[in-house]
């Protein structure tokens, strides 16, 4: 099965600049293959832009300006980019790539989108950190004693822009687990949103990780926040004068400033 | 020029009582096309479920159907028993692909339709109210109640800010919510529920413990790293040496 | 934000294979594409490859096409990289590395040294 | 394939020096720039993206500029552990490539 993976969120760009957006292309030969890009301006039906075909063809929608969109495939990097020049108010759009997958006849073709790239254009240059910041709440002693069960919640404030998207993994896991959030608030001119998670009693042992993707993560990777194992059995131990930490002390910290 | 009008620009539903999403082509004939559906998802996600000829997304066989009017020139699609899930725009389009004639492989939108999920009517359920600190930071977590009508109050004398609740359905088919604020005295912030003509207060659902129940570490800042003045726990948690973790990263 | 582990040296003789590997940790493998450079002695660094280590999807330079093969073992979070038909040409420093976002990289592993000699 | 010219190829200056490292790219890139450093015998670092956002953890006397074809790495004031070769990398098509490098040597 054909597989759309659309690397970047966003892409925040300032006026008359150029946008590049990426795709690539897994499951499915590209060479084999057209790829589609669509628009989904704020508040209009999603457009089709431009297409590039297996022979390297490009199809544009009548009425779009040319020069504005340039396509390409690079069939060793089985990518599809879609170049946007001078970009203006009017581009500001989730861009979809898409393609037909390949079914045993014609007819029996379905189109598969990738997850879609926002493109913001600002008038502001951001210098300061926009990245989201962390805070974790552990589940409250009582919600553990009383439920069985524990809910970890992950607050990221103080981001730019407002695109982020957030999941939950158990380590060593690939399965995303069914969470619940809130929705993103504006405040000043940032953003913060909240997630939480809870599990059952049996899965409190095991680490969680609260997985953000946002465009200005530190170093432009997935920030990966964990959730330490909560252990429900306790012991009672002599403090120790002087400030040492052993291994199996590491800065006793586990964030369980959550009362009841 | 074609277009594809949906019947409702917004449709509740109920958990588990059948939907039914219509979408009308104007200028042009129906058959002429192929129908398909999408459903776009918090997070932009468009994902394929139904395509004419019996073609269906993965995972959408079970719980949706689609079908064409070819008498009243609509497109329908039918989500049997709505879950949370369910939730999103979804949006009908065309194409020609396969067909002859003038051949389109791009495909034509109509505007989205907005589901919204609902619980079925149900008994009300008094909510479980509880609440997590981090700092300055409290979130009172309200948990399975129902009808929806809620009011929850962070009780404190500092308040820095505080934000709207997120309200959700739960997997259970009831709502929970989660409300969040900052105060200077975090400690003594508690967090009381107004819902169903009761208050229900998180101070209800304390355990009494000992002191050495759980860990009380210095307050730390929200996004700054551990204090680094050393404190004299009264116990420890075994976290299996997870507090290298980068909490506030 | 995790860490990138590569195996030890290798001394190959010219016209055999070899298969490096990347173990990773701290960070969510499937969602991320790991690649590959090359940096002879005293030179600059070549993109070879990179590969999603969930999907399995490989990019490659095109001059390294027929040359490398890269795989991945979601299982124990693992990239690989199987070098072919080895010359002298291709004793280098080999880098795994994690990709950003864009296309630069953001994680490096701490390299493996290949040398091929007769 | 766009090729990347960097100068100098090598650099001597002394501690709290301030030195600037140029890359030419042969066409137009528009910030889609990558800067590293690399220290003898060690992997190579990310310090610089998108032309000009530091890297987690790069102080800030790092500063990275540029547009089109022309691009630059400042380091303000000197340190001793800035010493090294450090490399600019453009990441605008495929396949991506690296400049030749600029050695960074202690005067």
């Known amino acids: 099965a054909g597989h759309l993976e659309q690397p970047q969120i966003s892409s925040t760009k300032t006026l008359s600049k150029t946008a590049r957006l990426e795709c690539v292309v897994s499951g499915i030969t590209i060479s084999a293959t057209s790829v589609y890009w669509y628009r989904e301006r704020p508040g209009e039906v999603i457009q089709f832009l431009v297409s590039i075909s297996y022979d390297g063809t490009v199809r544009k929608e009548s009425g779009i300006p040319s020069g504005k969109f340039e396509v390409d495939r690079i069939p060793e990097t089985s990518t599809s980019t879609l170049t946007i020049h001078n970009v203006e108010k009017q581009d500001i759009a989730t861009y979809y790539c898409a393609l037909w997958e390949a079914q045993q006849e014609l007819g029996k073709k379905i189109k598969v989108f990738g997850p879609g790239t926002k493109l913001i254009i600002t008038d502001k240059q951001l210098d300061a950190d926009v990245s989201p910041k962390p805070t974790i709440f552990l589940p409250s002693i009582a919600e553990t004693k009383l439920q069985k069960a524990g809910t970890y919640l992950c607050l990221l404030e103080k981001f730019f822009p407002d695109v982020i998207k957030i999941h939950w993994q158990e380590k060593k896991s690939n399965t995303i687990l069914g969470s619940q959030e809130g929705n993103t608030m504006k405040t000043n001119d940032t953003y913060m949103k909240f997630s939480w998670l809870t599990v059952p009693e049996k899965s409190l042992d095991k680490e969680h990780r609260c997985i953000v993707r946002h465009e200005n993560n530190k170093n432009g990777v997935d920030q990966e926040i964990i959730f330490p194992p909560i252990k429900t059995d306790v012991i009672t131990m002599d403090p120790k004068d002087n400030c040492s930490k052993d291994a199996n002390d590491t800065l006793l910290l586990q964030l369980t400033n959550t009362s009841a | 020029a074609i277009e594809l009008v949906p019947e409702h620009q917004t449709v509740p539903v109920s958990i588990g009582v059948p939907a039914t999403l219509r979408c009308s082509m104007k200028g042009e004939a129906i058959g002429n096309y192929y129908i398909n559906w999408y459903r776009k998802t918090q997070g932009n996600t468009m994902t394929f479920i139904y395509r004419e000829k019996d073609i269906y997304g993965p995972g959408f066989k079970d719980n949706f159907q689609g079908d064409i009017d070819i008498a009243k020139n609509l497109a329908v699609l039918k989500i049997l028993a709505p879950s949370e899930r369910d939730e999103g725009s979804y949006y009908c389009a065309c194409d020609t692909l396969g067909m002859g004639g003038e051949y389109t492989d791009k495909l034509i939108f109509g505007k989205g339709t907005r589901v919204t999920v609902e619980p079925r009517s149900q008994p009300h359920t008094k909510p479980s109210v509880f609440v997590m600190k981090n700092g300055t930071n409290v979130a009172c977590l309200v948990k399975e109640f129902y009808p929806k009508d809620i009011r929850i109050n962070l009780v404190s004398s500092k308040k820095i800010t505080e934000f709207d609740p997120a309200i959700v359905i739960s997997p259970s088919g009831k709502y929970n919510a989660v409300k969040l604020g900052k105060y200077e005295d975090s400690n003594s912030v508690t967090c009381s529920v107004q819902h169903d003509n009761k208050t229900v207060h998180s101070t209800d659902f304390e355990v009494k413990t000992d002191s050495t129940d759980h860990v009380k570490p210095k307050e730390t800042e929200n996004t700054k790293q551990p204090s680094k003045s050393c404190h004299k726990p009264k116990a420890i948690v075994h976290t299996e040496k997870v507090n290298m973790m980068s909490l506030t990263v | 934000q995790g860490q990138m582990q590569q195996s030890g040296a290798e001394l190959v003789k010219p016209g055999a294979s070899v298969k490096l590997s990347c173990k990773t940790s701290?960070?969510?493998?499937?969602?991320?594409?790991i690649s590959w450079l090359k940096q002879k002695p005293g030179q600059s660094l070549e993109w070879i490859a990179w590969?999603?280590?969930?999907?399995?999807?490989?990019g490659y330079n095109q001059k390294f096409t027929g040359k490398a093969q890269l795989t991945v073992d979601t299982s124990s979070t693992t990239a690989y990289m199987q070098f072919s038909s080895l010359t002298t040409e291709d004793s280098a420093i080999y880098y795994c590395?994690?990709?950003?976002?864009?296309?630069?990289?953001?994680?490096w592993g701490q390299g493996t040294l290949v040398t091929v000699s007769a | 394939d766009i090729q990347m010219t960097q100068s100098p190829a090598s650099l001597s200056a002394s501690v709290g020096e301030t030195v600037t490292i140029t890359c030419r790219a042969s066409?137009?890139?528009?910030?889609?720039l990558a800067w590293y450093q690399q220290k003898q015998g060690k992997s190579p670092q990310l310090l610089v993206y998108?032309?000009?956002t530091l890297a987690d953890g790069v102080p800030s006397r790092f500063s990275g500029s540029g547009s089109g074809t022309q691009y630059s790495l400042k380091i303000n004031s000197l340190q001793p552990e800035d010493f090294g070769n450090y490399y600019c990398?453009?990441?605008?098509?495929?396949?991506?490539?690296f400049g030749a490098g600029t050695k960074l040597e202690l005067k």
């Open positions: 590395a994690r990709r950003g976002y864009g296309a630069w990289f953001a994680y």
């Open positions: 701290g960070f969510t493998f499937s969602s991320n594409y």
């Open positions: 590969i999603h280590g969930g999907t399995g999807g490989i």
């Open positions: 066409e137009n890139i528009h910030n889609y």
């Open positions: 998108n032309a000009k």
């Open positions: 990398q453009h990441f605008w098509s495929y396949p991506l490539t």
